[in-house]
């Protein structure tokens, strides 16, 4: 295709006449604004086709694009279409008129767009402004196309000065529809309700402006529809929430509630479900086993924990020996009940630096108007063993006795042992265990007493040695669940002058 004059940009005088010619090897045609203006088409003897477009009495409204294309324009190649842009500076025409479709620009993503305000004179300075502001925006301008850039959701106008007259364009409206992949979250005020109470569920979508919510729920399947309410969360942009509210729930309302959200612009969708349980009346249920005998170690802190589930939230009380417990001001007892999930609770009794007097019968009671549960256990305070006395004596009978006395809780075990080779035992040789064996020349007698007030056992054990022929190291070891203690004494033969 050959166009004369070649352009690609021409500036023509207003009221003048101008001739555009296009020729090619196949039939050609001039197009203006997707239409074919009146033109003269011809075919030369050499087979060349041409079209002549005569523009008469030019005005500013003739400003714009002109295309020459092959008349049979199937499968257009780039060389089969020539573009020419003509300016006709005309002080009587401010901005060229736009189709209505050009004034309203809709986007679903952040992308460059053009605000197509065009003037008839390429020498004019054109500025872009928000409709409600005077400041010119720093956006590049192309006299043939307009302002191109990434625009916010606003209304814009273009301004230029023709002579001493300021001219405004029509307003251009840019709308961005906020669309993203859908991520739905569903939650309920309560997932467990008693019959007669309300069920309220919320379905929230973030990052989209136009979505459609559809709920499915047990009542819907039986044809009893509930109208959800949709609102926009003020403090969070593009947060849309649908609320499904079912007053006075029935047992049949138990089941799965699903919120399905669709967005038609990009055809995204997501759904989330939540289970709701409607109970006839409230309940309190213990979870897990708590042994009827619990232990705490003297002067250590001990936390006793009970896990249960309940609805509605219960009152929790602790008792010791049938007397109500409360947080002590001295900080010796701490009570707490935590809600670890909607219907699950953990109640804890913490005894700080346990004292012997804190042994006893404990009960936790959890209750509300519909149900109650209680759990009891005995608390035993364990006391590490202490050897209180280890003494040796020589009765007239000629035998030698060693007495060991100690205390602890639970009841201590006593172990007697001896080292006959003082040089090598106990480092190289193990001590010999002593007891009531017939082979050994020793006898053992042990008495155990329980002291109610101190709540601990006392063990008194006497070891009788028949004859001691050389010095002997005798060791008394007391052992219980929380510790052990040892003392030793040297027993010498009667025949030796020293003891």
């Amino acid at each position: 295709l050959v166009v004369t004059p070649p352009g690609p940009e021409l500036v023509l005088n207003v009221s003048s006449t101008f001739v555009l010619t296009c020729s090619g090897s196949a039939p050609v045609v001039w197009e203006r604004m997707s239409q074919e203006p009146p033109q003269e088409m011809a075919k030369a003897q050499d087979g060349t086709f041409s079209s002549v477009l005569t523009l008469t009495n030019l005005t500013g409204l003739d400003t714009g694009e002109y295309f020459c294309t092959h008349n049979d324009s199937r499968g257009l190649e780039t060389d089969e279409r020539k573009r020419l842009y003509i300016f006709v500076p005309d002080p009587t025409v401010g901005f060229l008129p736009n189709d209505a479709e050009e004034l309203f620009i809709f986007l679903t993503e952040i992308t460059e767009i053009t605000i197509p305000c065009r003037v008839t004179d390429p020498q004019l300075v054109v500025t872009l402004h928000e409709k409600k502001g005077d400041v010119a925006l720093p956006v590049p301008y192309d006299h043939q196309r307009g302002f191109s850039g990434i625009f916010e959701d606003r209304s814009y106008i273009c301004k230029t000065t023709i002579g001493d007259r300021e001219v405004d364009s029509d307003a251009y409206y840019v709308y961005r529809l906020q669309v993203s992949s859908i991520n739905v979250s569903v939650n309920a005020v309560q997932t467990v309700v008693r019959q007669g109470e309300n069920i309220t569920l919320m379905c929230i979508v973030i990052g989209n402006e136009v979505v459609n919510f559809e709920w499915t729920y047990p009542r819907k399947e039986s044809g009893r529809l509930v109208e959800p309410v949709t609102d926009f969360l003020l403090d969070m942009p593009y947060h849309i929430r649908s609320i499904l509210h079912i007053p006075s729930a029935e047992l049949e309302d138990s089941g799965t509630y699903t919120c399905n959200v669709t967005e038609s612009v990009n055809d995204h969708q997501d759904e989330k479900a939540i289970n709701i349980t409607v109970v006839e009346s409230g309940y309190v249920r213990l979870l897990g086993e708590v042994g009827t005998l619990q232990f705490a170690e003297l002067h250590r802190s001990r936390t006793l924990q009970v896990v249960f589930e309940a609805y509605p939230p219960p009152t929790v009380l602790w008792f010791k020996d049938n007397r109500t417990l409360g947080d002590s001001s001295a900080g010796e007892i701490a009570l707490s009940t935590r809600n670890v999930s909607e219907t699950r609770y953990v109640s804890e009794l913490t005894l700080v630096r346990v004292k012997v007097a804190e042994a006893g019968h404990y009960t936790m009671r959890a209750f509300h108007e519909d149900a109650e549960v209680q759990l009891s256990f005995q608390l035993q305070i364990n006391v590490p063993v202490r050897v209180l006395e280890l003494s040796e004596s020589h009765p007239d009978s000629g035998e030698q006795t060693v007495r060991c006395r100690g205390r602890g809780m639970p009841q201590p075990n006593i172990i007697w042992s001896a080292c006959r080779d003082l040089k090598r035992c106990p480092r190289e040789l193990p001590p010999t265990l002593l007891g009531n064996s017939s082979e050994e020349e020793s006898q053992l007698e042990t008495n155990v007493t329980y002291w109610e007030e101190e709540q601990e056992f006392e063990v008194v054990s006497t070891l009788r040695l028949q004859h001691v022929d050389r010095p002997l190291s005798v060791r008394c070891t007391l052992r219980n669940a929380v510790g052990q203690d040892t003392q030793e004494v040297i027993v010498v033969p009667h025949s030796l002058p020293f003891k």
Partner: nanobody
Framework: QVQLVQSGGALVQPGGSLRLSCAAS????????MSWVRQAPGKRLEWVSA????????YYAGSVKGRFTISSDNSKNTVFLQMNSLRAEDTAVYYC?????????WGQGTLVTVSS
């Protein structure tokens, strides 16, 4: 809180009429242009019509000019789209949209189905 609540979508036969409403709250219509936009199944968003805040100037896409009429009732803060001589190609989800402060706001959409 700016909110646009739409109503009026329905199934209608070709040649029939329908009137869509868009009730605005949280801002005054007389200060803002309001647009109607539609999206046919599997197609891109298409601008349909608009009205300026005063109600004095109306705009139409070529595809609906002469068949659709946009109007507003500023006392009720509501914009209407009267759709006559409906065709199968008018089947779409219709949205109303406006500017408010520093962003645009959209109605929830309403489905118009033109089918015999």
């Amino acid at each position: 809180q700016v909110q646009l609540v739409q109503s009026g979508g329905a199934l209608v036969q070709p040649g029939g009429s329908l009137r869509l409403s868009c009730a605005a709250s949280g801002f005054t219509l007389s200060n803002n242009a309001m647009s109607w936009v539609r999206q046919a199944p599997g197609k891109r968003l298409e601008w349909v019509s608009a009205i300026d805040g005063s109600g004095g100037t109306t705009y139409y896409a070529g595809s609906v000019k002469g068949r659709f009429t946009i109007s507003s009732d500023n006392s009720k803060n509501t914009v209407f789209l009267q759709m006559n001589s409906l065709r199968a190609e008018d089947t779409a989800v219709y949205y109303c949209a406006t500017h408010g402060g520093d962003r645009s706001y959209w109605g929830q959409g309403t489905l118009v189905t033109v089918s015999s």
